[in-house]
Interface confidence: low
């Protein structure tokens, strides 16, 4: 019952432009190409675009013209090797263009970059962003696209296209608004929150596709759309894991026409099938395909049946659990992950699975031995300090956000990561304790019941920036540990770690320390973030300094930039105070 | 466990055929693209052909009108029908999925064309 069965097609290119339409071909292939060639001026990707969607015509006109049976990898490698500045502006990857497909687009795919060196976003006035907008609004969008694509490069692309038409909707309205500023801003920051997040969950899909393969991300997908779909059959969980394993590969892989297509045809296939998936997609079966395909994605669990039995019967009780796995084993511990997550919304996915790694361990062990069911019997037994584990660390984080707030919570964290893997650079410590913090405000709000699966799966994204921005640039042998052993055990081996006492503390630099009238101007998140970058750094100066030491220094650096900001001589105060203020603290904390 | 066992490979006059199959496991075949490569000593690995999980086949120019790639997903199988050889097609020839995703490939099967 594969979506995806498809005739054989003449022209790849053409079957493409016709399924997605031109104004969503034109789209993705813009993404595809920001997403590959990050530096590359914006007017340069245009050119490229509309050449390839103008040999595209050719195809759908007639499939039989020259190139038109290329296959897209070769007609868009092609298409990026034909830049001029491709050498001088990317060095090695000009090497990728004396490859033949598919290697050329491995070696695309692997010089992606997840910290490109591209200037921050600066918002400009409301009345200026307006204008812009009326006076063209297809450039204005396609800027969006290759902005956010190009910073992004594993973003979702065909929920890139959904970002978009919001982004769009927000300037249509909010332009013609009395209040513009009123109308638009918050828009603009609920996209740009929503956006750094669904971005971040992406790149662990594809993460999880990259470095631990298929099968690992199949078993992701079973427990998850086991939870929210726990009415439906397995074997129609398996289908749709299987075709949802087809699309995140296509994206993951850079095959963005395919992967929107396929998409597309995903969310076709639920909507036929709602009665046999789930209860609750009634209304998001309703909306256009954008807006539908985000909405089955977003969807909220289906009630659980009433009648479920008790897992025993059919994993530990039975005589046969030996006989079925050695059968088919993936099959077998497919159907336990289903009926294990069915039953438990309450738990993450990585917890789920690492309970059936536990089964999968025990039945590997038990199924060689003499009396293979006295065995296995207490399996269920060793599951419950795996879920203690999490249980009591949320109830410990979430009492210490309530008691903290968000930002010195941030701090908290800050200074418990800084001291596990004081190796890694300042601003990626700052980025990840301030995203690890924000689980604070996301999930301790929740009830019991959803606190786990909002708060360690959230944990689980996060902690995967740190893994991809390391990857680039490994410095710490625990953080590769953590990162590379297991995917469903990174944020369990992180929370064991203690504090690295090989680490050399850093050499006290004054520099370091030094600020400027410019603080003042900043806003309160910027101002937070150069607080934040100070404490990172003093914890690597001293990394032995208690919490009231650290406190203490740094409340008297908030009293100095009040203080600084209010003077009349701003950057005199700044000069001046600042020098007592690093006397102080390096008295306070032993330097 | 990802693995891929290629056969029907031997030797042949120039102008002869050979068919040549890859038989994949331990992945969901029906939904990755495939391709058949060749290796030469002291070459780089190239790509012969590779087919689309939809069906829809893409040649090398060197065997583009020679050779035919083909897919039975129900047998997760994919085939290499090679006509009028040359000797400039001697190699070991494997398959694979063309997705990074897998770093796999069979041993491949020695196909030399000679007179």
């Known amino acids: 019952r594969g979506v995806f069965r498809r005739d054989a097609h003449k022209s790849e290119v053409a079957h493409r432009f016709k399924d997605l339409g031109e104004e969503n071909f034109k789209a993705l292939v813009l993404i595809a190409f920001a997403q590959y060639l990050q530096q590359c001026p914006f007017e340069d990707h245009v050119k490229l675009v509309n050449e390839v969607t103008e040999f595209a015509k050719t195809c759908v006109a007639d499939e039989s013209a020259e190139n038109c049976d290329k296959s897209l990898h070769t007609l868009f490698g092609d298409k990026l090797c034909t830049v001029a500045t491709l050498r001088e502006t990317y060095g090695e990857m000009a090497d990728c263009c004396a490859k033949q497909e598919p290697e050329r687009n491995e070696c695309f795919l692997q010089h992606k970059d997840d910290n490109p060196n591209l200037p921050r976003l600066v918002r400009p006035e409301v009345d200026v962003m307006c204008t812009a907008f009326h006076d063209n609004e297809e450039t204005f969008l396609k800027k969006y696209l290759y902005e956010i694509a190009r910073r992004h490069p594993y973003f979702y692309a065909p929920e890139l296209l959904f970002f978009a038409k919001r982004y769009k909707a927000a300037f249509t309205e909010c332009c013609q608004a009395a209040d513009k500023a009123a109308c638009l801003l918050p828009k603009l920051d609920e996209l740009r929150d929503e956006g750094k997040a669904s971005s971040a969950k992406q790149r662990l899909k594809c993460a999880s596709l990259q470095k631990f393969g298929e099968r690992a991300f199949k078993a992701w997908a079973v427990a998850r759309l086991s939870q929210r779909f726990p009415k439906a059959e397995f074997a129609e969980v398996s289908k749709l894991v299987t075709d949802l394993t087809k699309v995140h590969t296509e994206c993951c892989h850079g095959d963005l026409l395919e992967c929107a297509d396929d998409r597309a045809d995903l969310a076709k296939y639920i909507c036929e099938n709602q009665d046999s998936i789930s209860s609750k997609l009634k209304e998001c079966c309703e909306k256009p395909l954008l807006e539908k395909s985000h909405c089955i994605a977003e969807v909220e669990n289906d009630e659980m049946p009433a009648d479920l039995p008790s897992l025993a019967a059919d994993f530990v009780e039975s005589k046969d659990v030996c006989k079925n796995y050695a059968e088919a084993k993936d099959v077998f511990l497919g159907m336990f992950l289903y009926e294990y997550a069915r039953r438990h919304p309450d738990y993450s996915v990585v917890l789920l699975l690492r309970l059936a790694k536990t089964y999968e361990t025990t039945l590997e062990k038990c199924c060689a031995a003499a009396d293979p069911h006295e065995c296995y019997a207490k399996v269920f037994d060793e599951f419950k300090p795996l879920v203690e584990e999490p249980q009591n660390l949320i109830k410990q984080n979430c009492e210490l956000f309530e008691q903290l707030g968000e930002y010195k919570f941030q701090n908290a964290l800050l200074v418990r990561y800084t001291k596990k893997v004081p190796q890694v650079s300042t601003p990626t410590l700052v980025e990840v304790s301030r995203n690890l913090g924000k689980v604070g405000s996301k999930c301790c709000k929740h009830p019991e019941a959803k606190r786990m699966p909002c708060a360690e799966d959230y944990l689980s994204v996060v902690l995967n920036q740190l893994c991809v921005l390391h990857e680039k640039t490994p410095v710490s042998d625990r953080v590769t540990k953590c990162c590379t052993e297991s995917l469903v055990n990174r944020r369990p081996c992180f929370s064991a770690l203690e504090v690295d006492e090989t680490y050399v503390p850093k050499e006290f630099n004054a520099e370091t320390f030094t600020f400027h009238a410019d603080i003042c101007t900043l806003s309160e998140k910027e101002r937070q973030i150069k607080k934040q970058t100070a404490l990172v750094e003093l914890v690597k100066h001293k990394p032995k300094a208690t919490k009231e030491q650290l406190k203490a220094v740094m409340d008297d650096f908030a009293a100095f930039v009040e203080k600084c900001c209010k003077a009349d001589d701003k950057e005199t105060c700044f000069a001046e105070e600042g020098k007592k203020l690093v006397a102080a603290s390096q008295a306070a904390l032993g330097l | 466990q990802v693995q891929l066992q290629e056969s029907g490979g031997g030797l042949v006059q120039p102008g002869g055929s050979l068919r040549l199959s890859c038989k994949a496991s331990g992945f969901t075949f029906s939904i990755y693209s495939m391709g058949w490569y060749r290796q030469v000593p002291g070459k780089e690995r190239e790509a012969v052909a590779t087919?689309?999980?939809?069906?829809?086949?893409f040649y090398a120019n060197s065997a583009s009108g020679r050779f035919t790639i083909s897919r039975d997903n129900a047998k997760s199988t994919v085939y290499l029908q090679m006509n009028n050889l040359k000797p400039e097609d001697t190699g070991v020839y494997s398959c694979?999925?063309?997705?990074?995703?897998?770093?796999?490939q069979g041993q491949g099967t020695q196909v030399t064309v000679s007179s």
């Open positions: 087919i689309s999980s939809g069906g829809s086949p």
């Open positions: 694979s999925p063309i997705t990074s995703i897998f770093k796999a």
